[in-house]
Interface confidence: medium
């Protein structure tokens, strides 16, 4: 049986979780993507999603979450900026491709955010907004009211996740270096 595992990431308040989820280009480039949290004893909750159809390199920001879908690279980038202790939890990246149930793109991420010095103003939202180079043309997208059931079972590819602090400008360089071969076929 193929059981999905968790990848643990321990970060400090004020830091950024930077996750790159790769997917099969031909199949899922324009499919809507979403970032979800799963709390113990609860169902998955969608925190943010791309537009439908998903637009290439077009940032979508919901609060402190920024999604960018790079069609050319088959890569969804998820950033959670100015992390807070309350952000700790289990997350997953999924693809909506009606009429199928969401595909999970990678092992779930167990995010642990702790208080501590990260070399930044930390929990002050206003001060970090000035440091981050978040594109001004962000769009809020409405997540789907529903998706239809999955009719096939597919194994998920891995993700890569990077950690950055508000000192560093967010950019996407050497993307080809971080893409792993997807399991989708």
């Amino acid at each position: 049986a193929t059981k999905l595992t968790e990848e643990k990431y321990e970060l400090k308040e004020g830091q950024t979780l930077d996750v790159k989820c790769d997917y099969t280009l031909e199949k899922f480039a324009s499919s809507q993507k979403a970032w979800q949290i799963i709390r113990d004893g609860e169902m998955p909750k969608t925190l943010a999603c791309t537009e439908r159809p998903s637009k290439n390199s077009h940032p979508v920001q919901v609060g402190r979450i920024i999604l960018e879908d790079y069609h050319d690279h088959g890569l969804l980038r998820v950033r959670m900026v100015n992390l807070q202790v309350e952000d700790s939890g289990l997350y997953q990246c999924v693809i909506y491709q009606p009429p199928k149930e969401p595909h999970m793109l990678f092992d779930r991420i167990r995010l642990v955010v702790t208080k501590g010095f990260s070399g930044t103003p930390g929990s002050n939202e206003n001060s970090t907004q000035n440091v981050y180079k978040i594109p001004p043309t962000t769009t809020k997208a409405l997540c789907p009211l529903y998706t239809s059931p999955r009719t096939v079972t597919q194994a998920p590819p891995k993700s890569t996740a990077d950690v950055s602090t508000p000192d560093s400008e967010i950019n996407l360089t050497n993307v080809t270096d971080i893409i792993r071969v997807p399991v989708f076929n």
């Epitope: 059981k3 609860e42 529903y146």
Partner: antibody
């Protein structure tokens, strides 16, 4: 191909607790809604409840007071316990995999086990 | 809860004929969250149709579903010998999840 297999005692005494386990193979237990359904001999199907891998449960109100579902993701198994059974609980018990519409509470059942007959009798 | 009433209880037809099965809900089924299952003796139910009209993977084109609200239909355009079984409708739009009483399609 996803396969589900129910296991547990075929005979349970009245007032005791019925315990069944479903083992999932050929697929992940993560991100699905694992469901129990029963079918009394010669009758229709009745939904018992489901459990998600986070431990979230949803039960049929008619059975809620007697039902407990649990899940062990490390073993790819989920289980059903039905307490204070009577002859009316005699049925074929099925486990099934559920997929869920976003924002909804009830899953569609796309893969089923073969079922196991549980008889309640002294 | 939503009560699903299937009719007829038994349908006697010959191979090659068209079968029309009805499922009526006591109240509207939200977003057409209605499914059809086929069950043969000693076997588990098999998903045929979901979302009232979408065929599940591997289901032949002769099976089709239609309807919305409270009235739904499963049609088997041309019965094959392996199609003789019991068919159940199921709604999953409102708790609790419920099934119809079933329609038995038997060989005439």
């Amino acid at each position: 191909q996803v396969q589900l297999q129910e296991s547990g005692p075929g005979l349970v005494k009245p007032s005791e607790t019925l315990s069944l386990t479903c083992t999932v193979s050929g697929g992940s237990i993560t991100n699905y809604y694992w469901t129990w359904i029963r079918q009394p001999p010669g009758k229709g199907l009745e939904w018992i409840g489901y459990i998600y891998d986070s431990g979230y449960t949803n039960y049929n109100p008619s059975l809620k007071s007697r039902v407990t579902l649990s899940i062990d993701t490390s073993k790819n198994q989920f289980s059903l316990k039905l307490s204070s059974v009577t002859a009316a609980d005699t049925a074929v018990y099925y486990c099934a995999r559920g997929v869920l519409w976003f924002g909804e509470l009830l899953p569609l059942l796309d893969y089923w086990g073969q079922g196991t007959l549980v008889t309640v009798s002294s | 809860e939503i009560v699903l009433t299937q009719s007829p209880g038994t349908l006697s037809l010959s191979p090659g004929e068209r079968a029309t099965l009805s499922c009526r809900a006591s109240q509207s089924v939200s977003s057409s969250y209605l499914a059809w299952y086929q069950q043969k003796p000693g076997q588990a139910p098999r998903l045929l149709i979901y979302g009232a009209s979408s065929r599940a993977t591997g289901i032949p084109e002769r099976f089709s579903g239609s309807g919305s609200g409270t009235d739904f239909t499963l049609t088997i355009s041309r019965l094959e010998p392996e199609d003789f079984a019991v068919y159940y409708c199921q709604q999953y739009g409102s708790s609790p999840l419920t099934f119809g009483g079933g329609t038995k399609v038997e060989i005439k």
